[in-house]
Interface confidence: medium
């Protein structure tokens, strides 16, 4: 079975690397426009010059294409936290990133936002914190670890995961429950 | 004060639709990027979807990306989430939140009481 091809790649594929198949000739293969350009007109024929453009301010191409507009620069979202890395030029994006002891925590495959890096306060750190994920952090004793926190084993109710962790503190807390009571 | 109040929950058989509102009171909604997150029954929550301010970046969870889709009417207060295709899977409470803190991931500055979708044939 032959791979489906969108048209665009159809026609490319045609051409040597760097050109495209003129969309009204496909006898004739126009250069592709660099990046920080997009495609004004097509090259009217064969050895002849493609008219490419320079991108506007606020849009971007960041490879060799034909394209016949520029790419809208991407907008660093304050409300997640995220602080501009680079700035938006005409052949590369806008770099998104969030601030010193910040991790990103990806909410889907576009969408990130920055949250501090956990301190392991009644812990110690087990592994550093990274650009794409929180320290991991080792508890000391008489603590458990709840959403990345070291909490005290006097939080530490029946049902819940940390009883093993907890076990010789639960058992005592029980023991002087159960000799109040007669 | 500020107010969130979820609505349109309900029992729905596998392949059905449901959406459910949000209305939201007490403070400049259409300041605000605004959130669905659930929580299915003995689990922890799941972020399903957030939407910008002015409503025009949608973002989902891959577990529900085709099948859901979140919009809001800044004019009316009242934050959607459509809900098509539903599976057995996204039986939870529903919550619609707001502004998330820098602390840690799930933590809101305001939640609603949360609405029930029930999945099941």
């Known amino acids: 079975l032959v791979p489906h091809l969108g048209d665009r790649e159809k026609r490319d594929s045609v051409c040597p690397q760097g050109k495209y198949i003129h969309p009204q000739n496909n006898s004739i293969c126009c250069t592709k426009c660099h990046k920080g350009t997009y495609l004004y007109n097509d090259c009217p024929g064969p050895g002849q010059d493609t008219d490419c453009r320079e991108c506007e301010s606020g849009s971007f191409t960041a490879s060799e294409n034909h394209l016949r507009h520029c790419l809208s620069c991407s907008k660093c979202r304050k409300e997640m936290g995220q602080v501009e890395i680079s700035s938006c030029t005409v052949d590369r994006d806008t770099v998104c990133g969030c601030r010193k002891n910040q991790y990103r925590h990806y909410w889907s495959e576009n969408l990130f936002q920055c949250f501090n890096c956990s301190l392991c306060l009644n812990g110690t750190v087990h592994l550093s914190c990274q650009e794409k994920q929180n320290t991991v952090c080792t508890c000391h004793a008489g603590f458990f670890l709840r959403e990345n926190e070291c909490v005290s084993c006097s939080n530490c109710k029946k049902s819940l995961e940390c009883t093993k962790l907890c076990l010789p503190q639960i058992e005592n807390v029980k023991g002087t429950e159960d000799s109040g009571t007669t | 004060e500020v107010q969130l109040l979820e609505s349109g929950g309900g029992l729905v058989q596998p392949g059905g639709s449901l959406r459910l509102s949000c209305a939201a009171s007490g403070f400049t909604f259409g300041n605000v990027d605004m959130h669905w997150v659930r929580q299915a029954p003995g689990k922890g929550l799941e972020w399903v979807s957030a939407?910008?301010?002015?409503?025009?970046?949608?973002y989902y969870a891959d577990s529900v990306k085709g099948r859901f889709t979140i919009s809001r009417d800044n004019s009316k207060n009242t934050l959607y989430l459509q809900m098509n295709s539903l599976r057995a899977e996204d039986t939870a409470v529903y919550y619609c939140a707001k502004r998330m803190l820098a602390n840690s991931p799930l933590a809101f500055d305001y939640w609603g009481q949360g609405t029930l979708v029930t999945v099941s044939s």
């Open positions: 939407i910008s301010s002015a409503g025009g970046e949608t």
